[in-house]
Amino acid sequence: MAVTACQGLGFVVSLIGIAGIIAATCMDQWSTQDLYNNPVTAVFNYQGLWRSCVRESSGFTECRGYFTLLGLPAMLQAVRALMIVGIVLGAIGLLVSIFALKCIRIGSMEDSAKANMTLTSGIMFIVSGLCAIAGVSVFANMLVTNFWMSTANMYTGMGGMVQTVQTRYTFGAALFVGWVAGGLTLIGGVMMCIACRGLAPEETNYKAVSYHASGHSVAYKPGGFKASTGFGSNTKNKKIYDGGARTEDEVQSYPSKHDYV
């Protein structure tokens, strides 16, 4: 029951997390104009991964897409890639985890197969969450660097007469959404991995055998020994761990693929 709850909760948390990652990726407020030095601006600038927007004094917001691909900063391209990889992995993870849910019966699927699928989806969620957190963190670092660079040459004088305030950008709402969503996806993935440990069928190493000693009619069942020493639980853990390690090795190929994105 606890395993089903852990798996179900892991799925729901990951689902919320991936929805958040998608939302963050689509949002326009990755960076917003810092109003500290210009609180009276009637023109408010903010930027996303795909377009930049300006809210004017009329309340009208005009957005312009980044219609160039080659002209964009490499860091922005990297952030886009990380977020998309996170979404794709998360979506595949969700698809896999639906079939892995203990509460859903699909034909005569073995519990061991469900355990492997749960672990696979869990690892996918973990990598997805890490991709989102990495993407948002790279963008945040980019903002901090640019912020202090623009602060250094804040005012560009025109013949020393007129001052033009350079627009500085600070953290937008999308960054916080991305961090939280990435964290949730990561937590959901860990929960799926934990649930996987309790999903594999319990296997006894010995069949119950009756030994007939001469003159006695006592049935000796080593299964009783298993329960008292905890040997069975060790066997269970070992069994799942071995299976888990194999699945984990298979999934390890994913991060290396990201190197080429």
Partner: antibody, heavy 115, light 113 residues
Framework: EIQLQQSGPDLMKPGSSVKISCTAS????????IHWVKQSHGKTLEWIGY????????RYNQKFEGKAALTVDKSSTTAYMHLTSLTSDDSAVYYC????????WGQGTLVTVSA | DIVMTQSPSSLTVTAGEKVTMTCKSS????????????LTWYQQKPGQPPKLLIS???TRQSGVPDRFTGSGSGTDFTLTISSVQAEDLAVYYC?????????FGAGTKLELK
């Protein structure tokens, strides 16, 4: 057709208050701020402030803070400007303006403050 | 507050003449976010509300004759009427649309000889 229809002229006593209305039609009322502008006789235009019909948020020119209060009624797509403690300096034509770059203006409301 | 200075305060012209009026702002009206200058020009005829002519320094409003041209960047802006018509006689205001409080110039009055 987009229109901003303002209330009629008002002759007010010094110290009294007046409420001018501006009813918008022909566009999405909550999508654009309603700005208010004062034009004293033979003088330039002065921006009073704006109200966001979407959430009722306001911003005022410091000069008119305490003098003008902006409100909105979404159901009737009407914006209001309440001017208090009227003096002869408040005698002017008051305009409401909206849409991008103040594309549309009301016809103006003449407020005359006289004893 | 951004101060808008218009010159000349009045202009006396003959029909068909080319007219240029200027507007200077005390601070730059250039928004680095989209590289647009938030300077607006209005025309006001007696007894009427102002009418939008040009937004963002050079974008002519639809329905405005092409004899009206806006130019300039940063702090210096110009409104040019290539060939003045009788119906152009009015007061022309420039407006800072970049920073609160939004401010208007004192206006340039266009009169016929």
């Amino acid at each position: 057709e987009i229109q901003l229809q303002q209330s009629g002229p008002d002759l007010m006593k010094p110290g009294s208050s007046v409420k001018i209305s501006c009813t918008a039609s022909g566009y999405s009322f909550t999508s654009y701020y309603i700005h208010w502008v004062k034009q004293s006789h033979g003088k330039t235009l002065e921006w009073i402030g704006y109200i966001d019909p979407f959430n009722g948020g306001t911003r005022y020119n410091q000069k008119f803070e305490g003098k003008a209060a902006l409100t909105v009624d979404k159901s009737s797509t009407t914006a209001y400007m309440h001017l208090t403690s009227l003096t002869s300096d408040d005698s002017a034509v008051y305009y409401c303006a909206s849409l991008r770059f103040f594309t549309y203006w009301g016809q103006g409301t003449l407020v005359t403050v006289s004893a | 507050d951004i101060v808008m200075t218009q010159s000349p305060s009045s202009l006396t012209v003959t029909a068909g003449e080319k007219v240029t009026m200027t507007c200077k702002s005390s601070q730059s009206l250039l928004n680095s976010g989209n590289q647009e200058n938030y300077l607006t020009w209005y025309q006001q005829k007696p007894g009427q509300p102002p009418k939008l002519l040009i937004s963002r320094a050079s974008t002519r409003q639809s329905g405005v004759p092409d004899r009206f041209t806006g130019s300039g960047s940063g702090t210096d802006f110009t409104l040019t009427i290539s060939s003045v018509q009788a119906e152009d006689l009015a007061v022309y205001y420039c407006q800072n649309d970049y920073s609160y409080p939004l401010t208007f110039g004192a206006g340039t009055k266009l009169e016929l000889k």
